[in-house]
Interface confidence: low
C-alpha cells in the first residue's frame, strides 16, 4: 500500500481540549494528545515504535502504536511490556470561514473518498464524520482483530492526512492535497488529534504538579 | 527579577480550539497558538526573539515577542520589519477532577498571588481569572506603553508558569510548584496558550491546503 508502513513518523500530533458542541464527539477521558513535541524514536525492524522510548539523558516512557506517550516519564528501570495498539483516532479540524456551511453528506462522502483513495484506508475503518460548522471530526476505528494483512493502519492514514492538511505532503512526486466539497475549497486552519488505546494509559494523578 | 529575561525559551506553547463555555473567554480570531513544535531560535543580545526566524533548511517566518510564528512560512526573501509585541495572553487550563469545584474567589486570589510572588509579575498585568469547572482561564495583558523598565514580561511569566505546571520548573534550587486553593491541590492536566499581538498576524487564506 502507498500510505506509510513506518508509523514511527508520527511525531507531530497536537494537543487540545474536548469540544462541548452538540453534534460533536467528546473525547474519552483516556484520550491521549501528544504534548511532548518531537523526539527521535526507537523503531523496530518493521518500522513500528518500540514500546519503550528513551531520550539521550536516559529518561524513558512507554508509547502506543502511534508513538504517543502513555505513561509517566521514568528512568531506565521503566518496563513497557507490550506495544499497546491505538484503536480509535479522533481527528478534529476547524475549517476557514466559508460563504455557508458545507453540506454534511457531501463533506462525509468527500472525506471517506479521500481516506479510501489517497491513503488506501479500507472504508470500514472510517467510523464517522461529524460536522458542526466550523468543526469537522473524523473518527477512525480499527481493532487488532479487524486489521487484516495488508490493511493500512489508521495511525498511518491519520499521519499522512495530517501532513497533507499542513501542506507538508509525504507523497513524493504527487500533487499536494486539494480538498474540495462540491467544488468549494475546504481550507483547514487547525488540526487536533486524539488517540484512544485498547488499554487505558497509565498516568499518576500527581504527574503535573 | 527572577523570572526569565530570556523569552527565547518559549518554545513549547500548545495548540487548541476555542471554548464555547458560558463564563469563559473566546479567543480572538487573531489569536495565535504554536502548532509548529520546537525550533532552535535566533535571539538578539538581550535574549529577545529576532523578528525573523529560519530553520536549518532556510525556511523562514516572522515571530512575535514570545516566538510564535505570525506569518506564513516563506523563503530567504521574507522580511520581518519589526518584532511585534504580544500584548494579551490567554492561558487555558483544565484541572483534574476534585470533590467539588474550587471557590472562584479563592482560585482567583491564589493565581494572582502566584504570578505576583513566584513570577514577579505586577498584579495590574493579570487582567482576569475565569473559572468554569474544570476549565480555568488566566488573562494576562500588557501593552508596550504599560511596561516599565524592570517589569517582567507577560510572555516570560506565562512561560515559567507553563513549565512549572508541567513539572519542569525553570527555577534553580527552588522547590517545584505546589499549587493549592484553601489547602486543596490544584492539579492541572492540560495547558493551552493563546497569544494576541498588537498587530494582527498575516496569514494567507490558503496556507494549509
Amino acid at each position: 500500500h502507498t500510505a506509510a508502513q513506518d508509523n514511527c513518523l508520527l511525531l507531530k500530533a497536537r494537543m487540545s481540549a474536548p469540544k462541548n458542541a452538540r453534534t460533536l464527539v467528546r473525547p474519552s477521558e483516556h484520550a491521549l494528545v501528544d504534548n511532548d513535541g518531537l523526539y527521535d524514536p526507537d523503531c523496530d525492524p518493521e518500522g513500528r515504535f518500540k514500546a519503550r522510548q528513551c531520550n539521550q539523558t536516559s529518561v524513558c516512557w512507554c508509547v502506543n502504536s502511534v508513538g504517543v506517550r502513555r505513561t509517566d516519564k521514568g528512568d531506565l528501570s521503566l518496563r513497557c511490556d507490550e506495544l499497546v495498539r491505538t484503536h480509535h483516532i479522533l481527528i478534529d479540524l476547524r475549517h476557514r470561514p466559508t460563504a455557508g456551511a458545507f453540506n454534511h453528506s457531501d463533506l462525509d462522502a468527500e472525506l471517506r473518498r479521500l481516506f479510501r483513495e489517497r491513503y488506501r484506508l479500507h472504508p470500514k475503518f472510517v467510523a464517522a464524520v461529524h460536522y458542526e460548522q466550523p468543526t469537522i471530526q473524523i473518527e477512525l476505528r480499527q481493532n487488532t482483530s479487524q486489521k487484516a494483512a495488508g490493511d493500512v493502519d489508521i495511525g498511518d492514514a491519520a499521519y499522512y492526512f495530517e501532513r497533507d492538511i499542513k501542506g507538508e505532503s509525504l507523497f513524493q512526486g504527487r500533487g499536494g492535497l486539494d480538498l474540495r466539497v462540491r467544488g468549494e475549497p475546504l481550507q483547514v486552519e487547525r488540526t487536533l488529534i486524539y488517540y484512544l488505546d485498547e488499554i487505558p494509559p497509565k498516568f499518576s494523578m500527581k504527574r503535573l504538579t | 527579577h527572577t523570572a526569565a529575561q530570556d523569552n527565547c525559551l518559549l518554545l513549547k506553547a500548545r495548540m487548541s480550539a476555542p471554548k464555547n463555555a458560558r463564563t469563559l473567554v473566546r479567543p480572538s480570531e487573531h489569536a495565535l497558538v504554536d502548532n509548529d513544535g520546537l525550533y532552535d531560535p535566533d535571539c538578539d543580545p538581550e535574549g529577545r526573539f529576532k523578528a525573523r526566524q529560519c530553520n536549518q533548511t532556510s525556511v523562514c517566518w516572522c515571530v512575535n515577542s514570545v516566538g510564535v510564528r505570525r506569518t506564513d512560512k516563506g523563503d530567504l526573501s521574507l522580511r520581518c520589519d519589526e518584532l511585534v509585541r504580544t500584548h494579551h495572553i490567554l492561558i487555558d487550563l483544565r484541572h483534574r477532577p476534585t470533590a467539588g469545584a474550587f471557590n472562584h474567589s479563592d482560585l482567583d486570589a491564589e493565581l494572582r498571588r502566584l504570578f505576583r510572588e513566584r513570577y514577579r509579575l505586577h498584579p495590574k498585568f493579570v487582567a482576569a481569572v475565569h473559572y468554569e469547572q474544570p476549565t480555568i482561564q488566566i488573562e494576562l495583558r500588557q501593552n508596550t506603553s504599560q511596561k516599565a523598565a524592570g517589569d517582567v514580561d507577560i510572555g516570560d511569566a506565562a512561560y515559567y508558569f507553563e513549565r512549572d505546571i508541567k513539572g519542569e520548573s525553570l527555577f534553580q534550587g527552588r522547590g517545584g510548584l505546589d499549587l493549592r486553593v484553601r489547602g486543596e491541590p490544584l492539579q492541572v492536566e492540560r495547558t493551552l496558550i493563546y497569544y494576541l499581538d498588537e498587530i494582527p498576524p498575516k496569514f494567507s487564506m490558503k496556507r494549509l491546503t
Epitope: Q172 | C54, T57, S58, V59, C60, G74, D75, L76, S77
Partner: antibody, heavy 121, light 107 residues
Framework: QIQLVQSGPELKKPGETVKISCKAS????????MNWVKQAPGKGLKWMGW????????TYAEEFKGRFAFSLETSASTAYLQINNLKKEDTATYFC??????????????WGAGTTVTVSS | DIVMTQSHKFMSTSVGDRVSITCKAS??????VAWYQQKPGQSPKVLIY???YRYTGVPDRFTGSGSGTDFTFTISRVQAEDLAVYYC?????????FGAGTKLELK
C-alpha cells in the same frame, strides 16, 4: 542519478541573443527551484537569480534585471537562461544549480557543468 | 546586499596539514552559510551547508563552524585532491552572495 545537463559553448557577437538550456533528470523537476550563477573568466561566483519551477515565476538579482530572462519547459524538465543584446562583459561560464523555495535549500546541491558564452566582435 | 569577505585569496599548505579558511559576513546571517569546492574546469561542489552540516557523501575531514558573521571552514588533513578554490556563500537572504574565493595551493 540526479544531474543537470547544460547546452554546449556559444560564440556570439555583441548585440546578439543567446539562450542556454539546463535539463534536469533523476528528480521531480517542480520540487526544486533552479538558480543561475555567473562566473567570469578567472573570477568568482555571482548569483543571477532563480526561477520557481512550480509557478514559472523568476526572481532576478539587481545586476541581472533587464537583459536576462529565465524560462521553463516543464514537460521537458528544462530551464533556460536567455541573454539579450549581448555585451563583452557577458563573456563567462553560466551554471544552473538546483536550489529551492518553500522548504528551501538555498545552497546549491546539484550543478550543471556550465555553459561558456564568449562575446566577441 | 550582504558582502561575504574571504580574507585570504591564496593559502599555501602541505599534504597532511590542517588548514582553516575564514569568511566574514557584513551582517548577521545566523548559520546560513555554505562552503563549495571548485576545481579548474569543473562546476562547484557543495561541502558544507548551514555553517556546519556536511553534505551527503562529503568526507569527514571537511568541517564548518560559526554563526552570526564569522565562519570557518577546516580541512583536518589536506590531501592532494583537496587543492582547489573554496567559496563561502550566505543562504540567509536574497540576493544570495558568495565570497571571492580562497585558492588552496601546495607550498
Amino acid at each position: 542519478q540526479i544531474q543537470l545537463v547544460q547546452s554546449g559553448p556559444e560564440l556570439k557577437k555583441p548585440g546578439e541573443t543567446v539562450k542556454i538550456s539546463c535539463k534536469a533528470s533523476g528528480y521531480t523537476f517542480t520540487n526544486y527551484g533552479m538558480n543561475w550563477v555567473k562566473q567570469a573568466p578567472g573570477k568568482g561566483l555571482k548569483w543571477m537569480g532563480w526561477i520557481n519551477t512550480k509557478t514559472g515565476e523568476p526572481t532576478y538579482a539587481e545586476e541581472f534585471k533587464g537583459r536576462f530572462a529565465f524560462s521553463l519547459e516543464t514537460s521537458a524538465s528544462t530551464a533556460y537562461l536567455q541573454i539579450n543584446n549581448l555585451k563583452k562583459e557577458d563573456t563567462a561560464t553560466y551554471f544552473c544549480g538546483r536550489g529551492g523555495y518553500g522548504s528551501s535549500y538555498w545552497y546549491f546541491d546539484v550543478w550543471g557543468a556550465g555553459t561558456t558564452v564568449t562575446v566577441s566582435s | 546586499d550582504i558582502v561575504m569577505t574571504q580574507s585570504h585569496k591564496f593559502m599555501s599548505t602541505s599534504v597532511g596539514d590542517r588548514v582553516s579558511i575564514t569568511c566574514k559576513a557584513s551582517q548577521d546571517v545566523s548559520i546560513a552559510v555554505a562552503w563549495y569546492q571548485q576545481k579548474p574546469g569543473q562546476s562547484p561542489k557543495v561541502l558544507i551547508y548551514s555553517a556546519s552540516y556536511r553534505y551527503t557523501g562529503v568526507p569527514d575531514r571537511f568541517t564548518g563552524s560559526g554563526s552570526g558573521t564569522d565562519f570557518t571552514f577546516t580541512i583536518s588533513r589536506v590531501q592532494a585532491e583537496d587543492l582547489a578554490v573554496y567559496y563561502c556563500q550566505q543562504h540567509y537572504i536574497t540576493p544570495l552572495t558568495f565570497g571571492a574565493g580562497t585558492k588552496l595551493e601546495l607550498k
